[in-house]
C-alpha cells in the first residue's frame, strides 16, 4: 500500500548530537533523512520524528501525538510513528478517522447485537429473524 502525506518535522538543521552517515544510491535508511546537498544521512530524533523507509527526505516526519480519548499502543521511534487507538467504549470509523466516537450502548428495538464495540468498529446489530 502507498503511503500518504504527513507533516515534516520542523528541524531545519542537524543538531550536533545527530549521527551522520553516507547515503547509499542517493538514499538514507529508515530512521534518517538526507542533507540538503545529498552528501549525508542524518538520524531522526527519537520521540520527535521518524522515517519508515529508505528515503531522501530533507526532514524526518513529525511523530503523531495521541489525542485525548486515545491511548498510545506504541511510542514513536526513529523508524516508526506512534500507534494510537481509541479508548475502550469508543471507535474510529474509516470515513471519519480524525476522531473517536462513542459506541452505541445497545441495538434498536427489533434488532440483536452480533458484534461488540472495538476500537475500530461500533457494535453490530442485525434484524431478528
Amino acid at each position: 500500500a502507498l503511503i500518504t502525506q504527513q507533516d515534516l518535522a520542523p528541524q531545519q538543521r542537524a543538531a550536533p548530537q545527530q549521527k551522520r552517515s553516507s547515503p547509499s544510491e542517493g538514499l538514507c535508511p529508515p530512521g534518517h533523512h538526507i542533507s540538503e546537498d545529498g552528501r549525508d544521512c542524518i538520524s531522526c530524533k527519537y520521540g520527535q520524528d521518524y522515517s519508515t523507509h529508505w528515503n531522501d527526505l530533507l526532514f524526518c516526519l513529525r511523530c503523531t501525538r495521541c489525542d485525548s480519548g486515545e491511548v498510545e499502543l506504541s511510542p514513536c521511534t526513529t523508524t516508526r510513528n506512534t500507534v494510537c487507538q481509541c479508548e475502550e467504549g469508543t471507535f474510529r470509523e474509516e470515513d471519519s478517522p480524525e476522531m473517536c466516537r462513542k459506541c452505541r450502548t445497545g441495538c434498536p428495538r427489533g434488532m440483536v447485537k452480533v458484534g461488540d464495540c472495538t476500537p475500530w468498529s461500533d457494535i453490530e446489530c442485525v434484524h431478528k429473524e
Epitope: 503511503i3 515534516l8 542517493g26 538526507i34 519508515t52 523507509h53 529508505w54 531522501d56 530533507l58
Partner: nanobody
Framework: EVQLVESGGGSVQAGDSLRLSCAAS????????VGWFRQTPGKEREFVAA????????YYADSVKGRFTISRDNAKNTVYMQMASLKPEDTAVYYC???????????????????WGQGTQVTVSS
C-alpha cells in the same frame, strides 16, 4: 507544509503528446527526488518516472521508457513530464509525488511517497 500542484492533463488522441507540470509551494518539495505515479480505477498507483533535483538523474518505469521524459527547473521549483507517443493504456490520473519511499536502497521503483499532489487526468483515445 509541502504542497504539490499538477497541471497539463487533458484529452488527446493516440500518438499525441502532453506535458505535465508539478509545482511545489511551501517548503519546496521536501526531498531531492520528485516523481510521477499514475492510477486507473480499481488499481493501485504505479510508478512512472522520477528525477533527482540535484544532479538530474532520471528513473523510468519500463512501460514509459523512450516515450516519457522527466525534467526539472529548480529556479521555478517545478518538475515536468513530457509524454509522447501516448497510448490508450496511458489513460490515468497522474500524481506528482515527493518524499519517495523505497524498501531497499538499490531499488529503482519506490513503494510510495510522503507527499502527493491532487492528480491530473490524462485521457488517450484511439
Amino acid at each position: 507544509e509541502v504542497q504539490l500542484v499538477e497541471s497539463g492533463g487533458g484529452s488527446v488522441q493516440a500518438g499525441d503528446s502532453l506535458r505535465l507540470s508539478c509545482a511545489a509551494s511551501g517548503r519546496t518539495f521536501g526531498s531531492i527526488r520528485v516523481g510521477w505515479f499514475r492510477q486507473t480505477p480499481g488499481k493501485e498507483r504505479e510508478f512512472v518516472a522520477a528525477i533527482n533535483r540535484n544532479d538530474g538523474t532520471t528513473y523510468y518505469a519500463d512501460s514509459v521508457k523512450g516515450r516519457f521524459t522527466i525534467s526539472r527547473d529548480n529556479a521555478k521549483n517545478t518538475v515536468y513530464m513530457q509524454m509522447a507517443s501516448l497510448k490508450p493504456e496511458d489513460t490515468a490520473v497522474y500524481y506528482c509525488a515527493a518524499g519517495l519511499q523505497y524498501n531497499r536502497s538499490a531499488d529503482r521503483v519506490p513503494v510510495g511517497a510522503v507527499y502527493w499532489g491532487q492528480g491530473t487526468q490524462v485521457t488517450v483515445s484511439s
